[in-house]
């Protein structure tokens, strides 16, 4: 018996239609992406193949505008539209809240939204009961296939998920109900799940009864043969693991911002082992016609985002300096703005030792590509915002040594007065450079916020100490050369959309008053 | 199309038994459980159990544990109800419905309904 | 067993009027119940599952709603076709339970 499983993940709100690196579409011939061609692909393989399963891997919420706006109430929308049959749940759909997760997601959806190690309690658990499910069987052709969820144990550090539900070990809750599964005659078994690929496969390894993984959160690209795009592969498609009992566990993983469709087709025999699987993510490029029902929708509810731009979020009664003039060469008030949104859009007290989690950030200077004039009325719009931070990247959670961040630091001042974009801007951080220095010895003070302490103060940075930091997804990748932090970086999770964070800062504080005040020196 | 077509009316005498059939369409029977649900003059309905034809995992309503029998015949897509010692207060109009595999959801499609007359 | 307290027994109502029927769960059943319509030819169809969820090819005018073990379907304009009677019903824990009905006539 053959299935044919097709998987997205990490959509991050990307309902239109994209360019090649997944910013807003200028070209649309070159285009990529986007519900109504996704839809297009989906219904002509529906069309050919007999047993088909539309799955998403989670994080459909965060990282455009449409999110901003809607809240989830498209991604609802149109995922039914598109007719999933499976969601599990990302931790980006917890960053309204579980509020925010019920009432637009989890309310309206028309397919199952799974995780096996969310535990609900208190209050929340009557409320919530039903909405969301550790599995669920699917009637396939002439069988049932078993979905079973999961979530990144790390959300509570990631998101907002509230202090009523319990995110348990990803193995520790997915044994038992692949075991319940089981006593229901279900054979066929998929885990989908957000926890990233490291996690995906320990549960192929680990989790008895489990026969494919179906993965998100680390935006992971698969591919056998010649890639079709940028993308390179982190290992073939599937990645098979053999798990501890002997048997063959295919494992994908789709990239991410709808870009490519997961297919991937898998044999079982009478028993439900796989006998065999194949496939390749799908590059949902400009051959694929978008469906017009789907584009006409995306199109109407797109009247809705226009207006949006150019509502005021607050005001500013300062000059916010993003200019390269400033940004590149000193602290400028528009990093500063940035850093702090960045690290509130971050505070998670999570534990009474610690006053946050995360106290520091750093963001590169050439990423700020606008100042903001407050003799405007001091308005500040989403469309200025789109000016500053136009590449539509996010602002990210990393793990380094404190011995990366000195040498990112060092490379910040590397070739300093060139005016190029390396140049770090900061929160949470005291630096100090002395420029007569030779390149990679020119910092000369280090010190950082402390997070276990209840009232936040300045300490020597230590070499062998790991910390975490906030900082844009370019960075966490290597971009302007800062390759020591993608290299050395021990943990990486992907945050919020960059304009979203600073416009969410702003309305909240509804009057913004930025210095420059001595972070740098 | 899902379809749930039921045995015609029964007209039986106090104490005898009636087998009641549902024959499933337009979906693969063993991937839902079927349901029986009993509607007696001026009562409201009443759940009297489930049947998984996959796995022929059976649950009643304690009520119902005496009087009837859930069966199904996977070849024929049938899910059978016999209800047995048979006395006027089973006089009721009863219904299979399709059921939720692992019952997170409920009965999604009913049948027409068979009415059931107990009289001597 | 969980008893479900339906309200009101009956209605009158016009084409276009808001109609609203509430059902009380004798203890906590979450999210697991739905609405049922039944014409008066007997044929039963689910408009709701898991509370608010709508079933395929359900009017949008129909709705769920719920507050704590109170759980309300709406109509937020009536139509010729809704005239019927409607039933919740718990799929909490077994025995699966019905709430006593609602007829819901024209004025």
């Known amino acids: 018996w053959e299935l044919t499983i097709l998987h997205t993940n990490d959509v991050h709100s990307r309902l239109e239609q994209t360019s090649e690196d997944s910013s807003k579409c200028v070209n649309a011939s070159r285009c990529m992406g986007g519900v109504a061609r996704l839809f297009t692909k989906v219904q002509q393989i529906r069309r050919a193949e007999p047993n088909v399963l539309l799955l998403d891997a989670g994080d459909q919420y965060q990282g455009t505008i449409w999110f901003t706006v809607y809240k989830g109430a498209e991604v609802a929308h149109f995922m039914n539209a598109l007719r999933y049959d499976a969601m599990a749940l990302g931790n980006h759909e917890f960053d309204n809240g579980v509020e925010g997760l019920i009432e637009p997601l989890l309310k309206e959806a028309k397919f199952p939204i799974l995780s096996a190690n969310i535990k609900a309690k208190g209050p929340l658990a009557s409320q919530i009961s039903g909405l969301y499910l550790p599995y669920k069987v699917l009637p396939v052709g002439d069988e049932v296939v078993g979905i079973v969820g999961y979530t990144s144990k790390e959300t509570p550090f990631l998101s907002n998920p509230g202090t009523n539900l319990v995110f348990e070990d990803e193995i520790t809750a997915l044994q038992p109900e692949v075991d319940k599964l089981k006593t229901l005659n279900v054979n066929k078994i998929i885990a989908l799940g957000h926890s990233g690929f490291e996690m995906d496969k320990l549960i192929a390894q680990k989790v008895r009864g489990v026969d494919v993984v179906v993965g998100g959160h680390s935006n992971t690209f698969l591919y056998t043969g010649n890639p079709p795009s940028k993308e390179v592969p982190a290992g073939k498609y599937p990645f098979i693991v053999t798990s501890d009992d002997g048997r063959k566990v295919p494992v994908v993983q789709a990239y991410a911002f709808g870009k490519y469709l997961g297919y991937l087709k898998i044999e079982f025999d009478e028993r439900g082992n796989v006998i065999s699987s194949h496939g390749n993510p799908i590059l949902l490029n400009s051959s694929i016609p978008e469906d017009p029902s789907i584009k006409a929708d995306i199109n109407k509810w797109r009247i809705k985002l226009d207006n949006y731009s150019t509502q005021e979020l607050g005001k500013t009664i300062v000059y916010l300096d993003g200019s390269s003039q400033s940004c590149r060469f000193r602290e400028c008030n528009m990093g500063n703005l940035i850093c702090d949104a960045m690290i509130n859009n971050n505070l998670r007290h999570t534990d009474e030792m610690f006053w946050n989690h995360v106290s520091m950030c750093i963001l590169n200077g050439g990423g700020i590509r606008s100042p903001i004039d407050e003799r405007n009325n001091g308005t500040i719009t989403w469309e200025n915002l789109a000016a500053v931070l136009p590449f539509g990247g996010t602002f990210d959670l990393v793990q380094l040594k404190g011995s990366t961040l000195k040498k990112a630091f060092e490379h910040s001042v590397h070739r300093y007065g060139q005016s190029t974009g390396e140049f770090l801007q900061v929160g949470g951080i005291h630096v100090v450079y002395d420029l007569s220095r030779k390149p990679g010895d020119r910092v000369v003070k280090l010190d950082v916020l402390c997070t276990k302490c209840r009232v936040p103060s300045y300490d020597p940075l230590k070499m062998d100490e790991v910390y975490k930091v906030i900082l844009p997804n370019f960075l966490a990748n290597g971009g302007d050369g800062f390759q020591m932090i993608k290299d050395e970086l021990l943990r990486h999770d992907s945050g919020d959309q960059d304009i979203n964070v600073v416009s969410t800062y702003i309305s909240k504080m509804k009057v913004i008053y930025p210095a420059v005040e001595g972070r740098i020196k | 199309e899902v379809q749930l077509v039921q045995s015609g009316a029964e007209v039986k005498k106090p104490g005898a038994s009636v087998k009641v059939s549902c024959k499933a369409s337009g979906y693969t029977f063993t991937s839902y459980t079927m349901h029986w649900v009993r509607q007696a003059p001026g009562q409201r309905l009443e759940w009297i159990g489930y049947?998984?034809?996959?796995?022929?995992?059976?649950e009643y309503n304690q009520k119902f544990k005496d009087k009837a029998t859930l069966t199904a015949d996977t070849s024929a897509s049938t899910a059978y109800m016999e209800l047995s010692s048979l006395r006027s207060e089973d006089t009721a109009v009863y219904y299979c419905a399709r059921g939720d595999y692992d019952l997170f959801y409920d009965m999604d499609n009913w049948g027409q309904g068979t009415t059931v007359t107990v009289s001597s | 067993d969980i008893q479900m307290t339906q309200s009101p027994s009956s209605l009158s109502a016009s084409v276009g009027d808001r109609v609203t029927i509430t059902c009380r769960a004798s203890?906590?059943?979450?999210?697991?119940l739905n609405w049922l319509q039944q014409k008066p030819g007997g044929a039963i169809k689910r408009l709701i599952y898991a509370t608010f969820r709508l079933d395929s090819g359900v009017p949008s005018r129909f709705s769920g709603s719920r507050s704590g073990t109170e759980y309300t379907l709406t109509i937020s304009s009536l139509q010729p076709e809704d005239f019927a009677d409607y039933y919740c019903?718990?799929?909490?824990?077994?025995?699966?339970?019905f709430g006593g009905g609602t007829k819901v006539e024209i004025k």
């Open positions: 049947i998984n034809p996959n796995s022929f995992y059976i």
């Open positions: 203890q906590d059943i979450g999210n697991s």
């Open positions: 019903q718990q799929y909490a824990s077994f025995p699966w339970t």
